[in-house]
């Protein structure tokens, strides 16, 4: 009689993570008597996957009833496949022996490959805010995919970015892989409403890439511009001075008025107006009693924005010796303003 052969007809099997893999194996003869075992890998370090004689195999089932005397189908199914199950599986026939069964014949092996989807990309930006014209780095990470081939692209408001570096780890063979990419983005004053998108394409996604996003509103700080102006005289001895705080983001802002270097009033921006680009405007005014001053008055609008060092704009009010003689319009004179950092 012809010697028993162990036939594994499938050289390779490709299964998606979470699905069931069927590993086929048949024997050409009932002789010699002895059990079948399935192994992953070859040599002394192989892993026993299924043992016909004994054991508990929660994820492994046999395709046919191995207890039937004339059974020659030793195929198995492995459920809930994960990337860790990838490898070459061997169906091995043992000959009954004493005290041990002896390995008799092995199949050629079936390579199980597992396709696993990448996790949703997570995009993270810098820890601290940055101002326009600065370059900031964003990172994108996705994990758990297999096979290793993967494509990652970066976009800002739909426009593809080119300044990025990507690594797929590990470099060698692995059950699953991770991708890590860092992109550099130059901020502009208009970026409050901008988005950075990381897009990952993989064979398991069937042309529908995964995307992770980051809003630049979390990253950008647009410092305000200040303008101090003197309004027409409201009464004979009063001058209304306004400080226009324009185009700032985020909203966190505190304004202090100083008269000749002494704090007059401090307030926090509350009822701001929003610009189309997402930045804010705010106005504060100060009523100055000119008659209370004998000399010229230096008014300073000092703004602390988002915890940054204060910026200020000053305005000089000239206090006239005889305001009544000069008329109400000359009670105060705008002599220009100068911007300086008073810290």
């Amino acid at each position: 009689e012809e010697e028993l052969q162990v036939i594994q007809p499938d050289k390779s099997v490709l299964v998606a993570a979470g699905e069931t893999a069927t590993l086929r194996c048949t024997a050409t003869s009932l002789i010699p008597v002895g059990p079948i075992q399935w192994f992953r890998g070859a040599g002394p370090g192989r892993e026993l996957i299924y043992n016909q004689k004994e054991g508990h195999f929660p994820r492994v089932t046999t395709v046919s009833d191995l207890t039937k005397r004339n059974n020659m189908d030793f195929s198995i199914r492995i459920g809930n496949i994960t990337p860790a199950d990838a490898g070459t599986y061997y169906c091995v026939k043992f000959r009954k022996g004493s005290p041990d069964d002896v390995e008799f014949k092995s199949g050629a092996g079936t390579e199980l490959s597992v396709r696993a989807k990448p996790s949703a990309p997570v995009v993270s930006g810098p820890a601290a805010r940055a101002t326009p014209q600065h370059t900031v780095s964003f990172t994108c990470e996705s994990h758990g995919f297999s096979p290793r081939d993967i494509t990652l692209k970066w976009f800002k408001n739909g426009n593809e970015l080119s300044d990025f570096q990507t690594n797929v780890d590990p470099v060698g063979e692995s059950v699953s892989y991770s991708i890590h990419s860092t992109a550099k983005v130059v901020l502009t004053r208009e970026d409050v409403h901008s988005q950075v998108i990381c897009e990952v394409a993989h064979v398991t996604l069937q042309g529908d890439p995964l995307r992770g996003t980051a809003n630049l509103s979390e990253t950008i700080r647009v410092p305000p511009t200040l303008e101090v102006t003197q309004q027409p005289v409201r009464a004979e001895n009063q001058v209304n001075v306004t400080c226009q705080v324009r185009k700032f983001y985020p909203q966190r802002l505190q304004l202090t008025w100083l008269e000749n270097g002494n704090v007059s009033r401090t307030e926090t921006a509350s009822t701001v107006t929003e610009n189309k680009d997402g930045t804010y405007n705010w106005m504060s005014w100060l009523l100055v009693n000119v008659s209370a001053h004998r000399d010229d008055v230096k008014l300073t609008c000092q703004v602390e924005h988002d915890g940054q060092p204060a910026v200020s704009k000053s305005h000089d009010l000239k206090v006239s010796a005889h305001p009544k003689e000069q008329g109400s319009n000359t009670a105060a004179e705008n002599t220009g303003s100068n911007e300086r950092n008073i810290y």
Partner: nanobody, 124 residues
Framework: QVQLQESGGGVVQAGDSLRLSCVAS????????MGWFRQAPGKEREFVAG????????YYANSMKGRFTISRDNAKNLVYLQMNSLKPEDTAVYYC?????????????????WGQGTQVTVSS
Amino acid sequence: QVQLQESGGGVVQAGDSLRLSCVASGRTFSSLDMGWFRQAPGKEREFVAGISRSGISQYYANSMKGRFTISRDNAKNLVYLQMNSLKPEDTAVYYCAAALTFRGSDLPRDSNYWGQGTQVTVSS
């Protein structure tokens, strides 16, 4: 070289549950088949349960089937033995073992490394 350290033993009442843990170091854990054994006073060391390196196949001594469950966490280099419905005759020192090759309940012969053991006492 593989170092194994058991923990989780103690004194319990009959019918109670206990979970033993064994942490392995010194070699890639996912390349090791793992097992638990026990030795009662005056008796030989006996096989309790074994698990293959990925956890796909498990083996139990007949007297422990249904009561004991072996599992592993390859990310944490840990193997566990969950023991339910404990009996006074389960009193023993429980040993963790690691094998480079694994042939089911032939594990005692194949174990290359052993822990120091943890005492489990079940009182009636």
